[in-house]
């Protein structure tokens, strides 16, 4: 048993039929010695008396809020949560496996630049009685500070019969050095509590590996005289690291016809302009990627040819 936060405790249980469970001793936080009784949740049934209560925790029915009283007055509370271990593996029931980039990916994180700011998100089908707490650090043995905000519900979608809820959190490395080579990864730890169940999820990454620039901005077309060609121009996104001479991007320019089946013309360039043939009813799209490190491409910025 360990303390998650004040008056909230996690009991780790092997989740198979004949497992013995965990003996837990609760102590009433009071100078009182006599006349103390214990109850569980809203029940008025007295479970025991005395300053301590010993319970055998085997099931979710043994978890909950234990309260010690004296003469009708509440003295203190202890909330017991369960963390299930099945076949030696901690349960991962609360969050959905996003399966990208690989199986058992519950947390996904992205950064728009090298400032040390990043966003992580996760998915669940649970709509109520759900809380998350996020901690992060650079490295684990001698951790350097990363500050995370509160996790918030950022999107809801319908997936077949189920509703899916996306939560996200923003974190900022306290003493980020954008130009430095990373040697220790960022660690992100999410505590998830659904009713009486506790689970924890972790992710470990280098900022360089989760970079995904915003799309190029101010995408414009300039027709070239007496030609079907146009000059496409764009700018670095505002959120990208500066100076751009050091934090450089490379770009992919694509001409796409109305039909998805039509052949796409693609041009790669390090410049912020390109000359392409603009077909009728086609659109021109541009996306960006770190020039010197193959992390994710940005989403496309698009403009119609006509």
């Amino acid at each position: 048993i360990w303390e998650l936060k004040k008056d909230v405790y996690v009991v780790e249980l092997d989740w198979y039929p004949d497992a013995p469970g965990e003996m837990v001793v609760l102590t009433c936080d009071t100078p009182e010695e006599d006349g103390i009784t214990w109850t569980l949740d809203q029940s008025s049934e007295v479970l025991g008396s005395g300053k301590t209560l010993t319970i055998q925790v085997k099931e979710f029915g043994d978890a909950g809020q234990y309260t010690c009283h004296k003469g009708g007055e509440v003295l203190s509370h202890s909330l017991l949560l369960l963390h299930k271990k099945e076949d030696g593996i901690w349960s991962t029931d609360i969050l959905k496996d996003q399966k990208e980039p690989k199986n058992k990916t519950f947390l996904r994180c992205e950064a728009k630049n090298y400032s040390g700011r990043f966003t992580c998100w996760w998915l669940t089908t649970i709509s109520t009685d759900l809380t998350f707490s996020v901690k992060s650090s650079r490295g684990s043995s001698d951790p350097q500070g990363v500050t995370c905000g509160a996790a918030t519900l950022s999107a809801e979608r319908v997936r077949g019969d189920n509703k899916e809820y996306e939560y996200s959190v923003e974190c900022q490395e306290d003493s980020a050095c954008p130009a430095a080579e990373e040697s220790l990864p960022i660690e992100v730890m999410v505590d998830a509590v659904h009713k009486l169940k506790y689970e924890n999820y972790t992710s470990s990454f280098f900022i360089r590996d989760i970079i995904k620039p915003d799309p190029p901005k101010n995408l414009q077309l300039k027709p070239l005289k007496n030609s079907r060609q146009v000059e496409v121009s764009w700018e670095y996104p505002d959120t990208w690291s500066t100076p751009h001479s050091y934090f450089s991007l490379t770009f992919c320019v694509q001409v796409q016809g109305k039909s998805k089946r039509e052949k796409k013309d693609r041009v790669f360039t390090d410049k912020t302009s390109a000359t392409v043939i603009c077909r009728k009813n086609a659109s021109i799209s541009v996306r960006a990627q770190d020039r010197y490190y193959s992390s994710s491409w940005s989403e496309w910025a698009s403009v119609p040819c006509s």
Epitope: K58, E59, F60, G61, K195
Partner: nanobody, 125 residues
Framework: EVQLVESGGGLVQAGGSLRLSCAAS????????MGWFRQAPGKEREFVAA????????NYADSVKGRFTISRDNTKNTVYLQMNSLKPEDTAIYYC??????????????????WGQGTQVTVSS
Amino acid sequence: EVQLVESGGGLVQAGGSLRLSCAASGIIFSDNTMGWFRQAPGKEREFVAAIAGRGSRLNYADSVKGRFTISRDNTKNTVYLQMNSLKPEDTAIYYCAAKPYGRVYYTEGSNYDYWGQGTQVTVSS
């Protein structure tokens, strides 16, 4: 979508046995206390038995103690009710119910969140 599907009911002579099954889908089965309830014609629904998520805690109605056994197989997402020494007064529709993070001493139907459609058990004398 949560589904509880009972099976195994039927007509049996007094003193005989039946085994009811309830297959669950759409829930994290081992997190759920599973209960069996029954309703005889013209009577209130009554609690029969309950089993906690791991199977380590059980509860029975006094009327079935020593005759009925509740069990579960979490690998098959199924709960069972083995009914021996059946009596005519056991005749009823038997319902399976689920309560996430529930307690076995929940004997009120209102404490359970999910219900099956029921299976008929008839004991003839």
